[in-house]
Interface confidence: medium
C-alpha cells in the first residue's frame, strides 16, 4: 500500500534545503517548475543551513517534525468526520501550522518567528538556532528574493505533487 | 501557548542518534534513566548514521517526518471523537506506524524494513539508504544489543516525557 502523505513535495524541498546538497534541491525544484529567481531564493536559504553546520540542520529538522506531528497540526485537520478524514481531508494538504511557520521565517521579524517555534519546541538550543537561521536569511535575502520564495511556496502548495 | 507534541522525548532521541552527537544523545537518554547496556545499543545505531554521512541522516529524517505526518499516523489516532482528540488521545502518544518502523528496523529483515519505508517514501535513494542503515545495524548489534534497544524504547514510550 502506498500511503498518502501530507504534501510530500514540500518535505522533499525542505529536506533538500536543510541538507545543503544543491543537486538534490535542483531535482526537487524542477518538479514544481521553479523559475531561476525562485531557485536562487531557495539556495540562499539553503546556504544559511549549511553555513550554520550540521547541528543547525538537525535542530531545524526536529522543529519541522515536531510541528508536523503536533496536536496543533493534526487538530486543525479534524474539523471533519473521521470518515472524511480517512478519505481525503488530511491526506495531502500541508498543515496550516507549518505554512504559518514558513511564512514567518520569510516575512516575520526574528522575534515573531522564534515565538512561533517556541510553541512547539522550547529547548533553548532550538530557539537560539531558529534565531540564527532567521538572522542569516534576513541578511542574505533581498525583498525580491523573499517574494520569489513565497511564489515558489505557492507553486508547491498547489502542485499535484502536494 | 505550549502545544502538546506526539511523544517529544522519542523525537529528541531519534534526532540525537541521527545527528551523531554523543553528548546530545547522553542528555536525552539520561531523561529516561537508560542503563549502560541500553546506551551502548543506541550508540551502535548512532555509529551507523555517522558512518553513512550527512546524506544518511537527512534522508532518514525525511522518512521519519513523512511517516509522522502521514495519513496513516494521523488516521490511526482518529478513532475517537474530535473533542477527545483535541483533549488527549493524540496529544502525546507515539504513532503506531512509527513504532512499527522502529521495531522492524531492529527485529525485521532488511526486506521487511525497506518494504515498510517504501509505503511512505518510495524514492530509490531513500530506500537504498534505509537498506544501508539496516544492514549496518544488523552487522553492529548483537541480539542482546537489540533487546536492550527495545527495552529502552519501552522506557521512552511509557515515559512521562512521551
Amino acid at each position: 500500500v502506498k500511503m498518502a502523505e501530507t504534501c510530500p513535495i514540500f518535505y522533499d524541498v525542505f529536506f533538500a534545503v536543510a541538507n545543503g546538497n544543491e543537486l538534490l534541491l535542483d531535482l526537487s525544484l524542477t518538479k514544481v517548475n521553479a523559475t531561476e529567481p525562485e531557485r536562487t531564493a531557495m539556495k540562499k536559504i539553503q546556504d544559511c543551513y549549511v553555513e550554520n553546520g550540521l547541528i543547525s540542520r538537525v535542530l531545524d529538522g526536529l522543529v519541522m517534525t515536531t510541528i508536523s506531528s503536533s496536536k496543533d497540526c493534526m487538530g486543525e485537520a479534524v474539523q471533519n468526520t473521521v470518515e472524511d478524514l480517512k478519505l481525503n481531508t488530511l491526506g495531502r494538504e500541508i498543515c496550516p501550522a507549518v505554512k504559518r511557520g514558513v511564512d514567518l521565517f520569510l516575512t516575520g521579524t526574528p522575534d515573531e518567528y522564534v515565538e512561533q517555534v517556541a510553541q512547539y519546541k522550547a529547548l533553548p538550543v532550538v530557539l537560539e538556532n531558529a534565531r540564527i537561521l532567521k538572522n542569516c536569511v534576513d541578511a542574505k535575502m533581498t525583498e525580491e528574493d523573499k517574494e520569489n520564495a513565497l511564489s515558489l511556496l505557492d507553486k508547491i502548495y498547489t502542485s499535484p505533487l502536494c | 501557548v505550549k502545544m502538546a507534541e506526539t511523544c517529544p522525548i522519542f523525537y529528541d532521541v531519534f534526532f540525537a542518534v541521527a545527528n551523531g552527537n554523543e553528548l546530545l544523545l547522553d542528555l536525552s537518554l539520561t531523561k529516561v534513566n537508560a542503563t549502560e547496556p541500553e546506551r551502548t545499543a543506541m550508540k551502535k545505531i548512532q555509529d551507523c548514521y555517522v558512518e553513512n554521512g550527512l546524506i544518511s541522516r537527512v534522508l532518514d529524517g525525511l522518512v521519519m517526518t513523512t511517516i509522522s505526518s502521514s495519513k496513516d499516523c494521523m488516521g490511526e489516532a482518529v478513532q475517537n471523537t474530535v473533542e477527545d482528540l483535541k483533549l488527549n488521545t493524540l496529544g502525546r502518544e507515539i504513532c503506531p506506524a512509527v513504532k512499527r518502523g522502529v521495531d522492524l528496523f531492529l527485529t525485521g529483515t532488511p526486506d521487511e524494513y525497506v518494504e515498510q519505508v517504501a509505503q511512505y517514501k518510495a524514492l530509490p535513494v531513500v530506500l537504498e539508504n534505509a537498506r544501508i542503515l539496516k544492514n549496518c545495524v544488523d552487522a553492529k548489534m548483537t541480539e542482546e544489543d537489540k533487546e536492550n534497544a527495545l527495552s529502552l524504547l519501552d522506557k521512552i514510550y511509557t515515559s512521562p516525557l512521551c
Epitope: N19, G20, N21, E22, L23, D26, R39, T40, K43, K44, Q46, D47, C48, V50, E51, N52, G53, L54, I55, S56, E128, N129, R131, I132, N135, C136, A139, K140 | L54
Partner: antibody, heavy 120, light 106 residues
Framework: QVQLVESGGGLVKPGGSLRLSCAAS????????MNWIRQAPGKGLEWISY????????YYADSVKGRFTISRDNAKNSLYLQMNSLRAEDTAVYYC?????????????WGQGTLVTVSS | EIVLTQSPDFQSVTPKEKVTITCRAS??????LHWYQQKPDQSPKLLIK???QSFSGVPSRFSGSGSGTDFTLTINSLEAEDAATYYC????????FGQGTKVDIK
C-alpha cells in the same frame, strides 16, 4: 592531495580591471563551495566572496559588491574573480580557499595566494 | 554585519606555557566559529571548525570552546613552531574574520 593554485595577479592602475584564476586539483571540484579571501600587506584577513558548488548563488563583502564578480567553471576545475574599478585599497594577496563538502568547514584548504598591486 | 573582536592583539609567551585567545561576536552565531593559524609568508591553515572540532592533522594541544557570542582557542604547552597569527572566522551569516592575534615566543 588537494591543491589550489592562484594566478593572474600583477600591477594594475586605479580604475583598471584584472581577472584572477584558481586551478583546483585532487578533489571533485563541483562538490565544493569556493571562496576568495584577501590580505593587504601587513594586515589581517578579509573574506570577499564565495560561490556555491553549482555556481548558482554568490555572495560578496560590502567592500567589493558591484565591482567584483566570482564565477566558476566546473568542467575546467577553475574558480575566477573578475575585478573591475580597482582602487589602491584593493592591493593585497588574494587567496582562493575551499569549503568542506556541504560547507562542513569554511576554508579547509587554501592556495598560496597571488599578489595584486593597484598603483599609478 | 557580524563583527568579531579578538583579544589580545598580541601575546608574547614562553615555550610550554598555555595560551588563550578569545573571540567575541557582535550577535549570537551558535557554534559557527572557526580558527586559523597563519605563519609568516604562508597561507592560513584551518585548526578548529565549528567552535570545538579539531581539523584533521592538527596537533592535540590546540583546542576550541564556546558557543553563542564568546569563543576561546587554547594552545596547551606552546611549542616554538606555534609562533603565528591566529584568526577567528564566523560563517553564520556570510563571513567575517577577527582582526587577528599575533603570538610570538619569548
Amino acid at each position: 592531495q588537494v591543491q589550489l593554485v592562484e594566478s593572474g595577479g600583477g600591477l594594475v592602475k586605479p580604475g583598471g580591471s584584472l581577472r584572477l584564476s584558481c586551478a583546483a586539483s585532487g578533489f571533485t571540484f563541483s562538490d565544493y563551495y569556493m571562496n576568495w579571501i584577501r590580505q593587504a600587506p601587513g594586515k589581517g584577513l578579509e573574506w570577499i566572496s564565495y560561490i556555491s558548488s553549482g555556481g548558482s548563488t554568490t555572495y560578496y563583502a560590502d567592500s567589493v559588491k558591484g565591482r567584483f564578480t566570482i564565477s566558476r567553471d566546473n568542467a575546467k576545475n577553475s574558480l575566477y574573480l573578475q575585478m573591475n574599478s580597482l582602487r589602491a585599497e584593493d592591493t593585497a594577496v588574494y587567496y582562493c580557499a575551499r569549503d568542506g563538502k556541504y560547507n562542513t568547514s569554511p576554508g579547509d584548504y587554501w592556495g598560496q595566494g597571488t599578489l595584486v598591486t593597484v598603483s599609478s | 554585519e557580524i563583527v568579531l573582536t579578538q583579544s589580545p592583539d598580541f601575546q608574547s609567551v614562553t615555550p610550554k606555557e598555555k595560551v588563550t585567545i578569545t573571540c567575541r561576536a557582535s550577535q549570537s552565531i551558535g557554534s559557527s566559529l572557526h580558527w586559523y593559524q597563519q605563519k609568516p609568508d604562508q597561507s592560513p591553515k584551518l585548526l578548529i571548525k565549528y567552535a570545538s572540532q579539531s581539523f584533521s592533522g592538527v596537533p592535540s594541544r590546540f583546542s576550541g570552546s564556546g558557543s553563542g557570542t564568546d569563543f576561546t582557542l587554547t594552545i596547551n604547552s606552546l611549542e616554538a613552531e606555534d609562533a603565528a597569527t591566529y584568526y577567528c572566522l564566523q560563517s553564520s551569516s556570510l563571513r567575517t574574520f577577527g582582526q587577528g592575534t599575533k603570538v610570538d615566543i619569548k
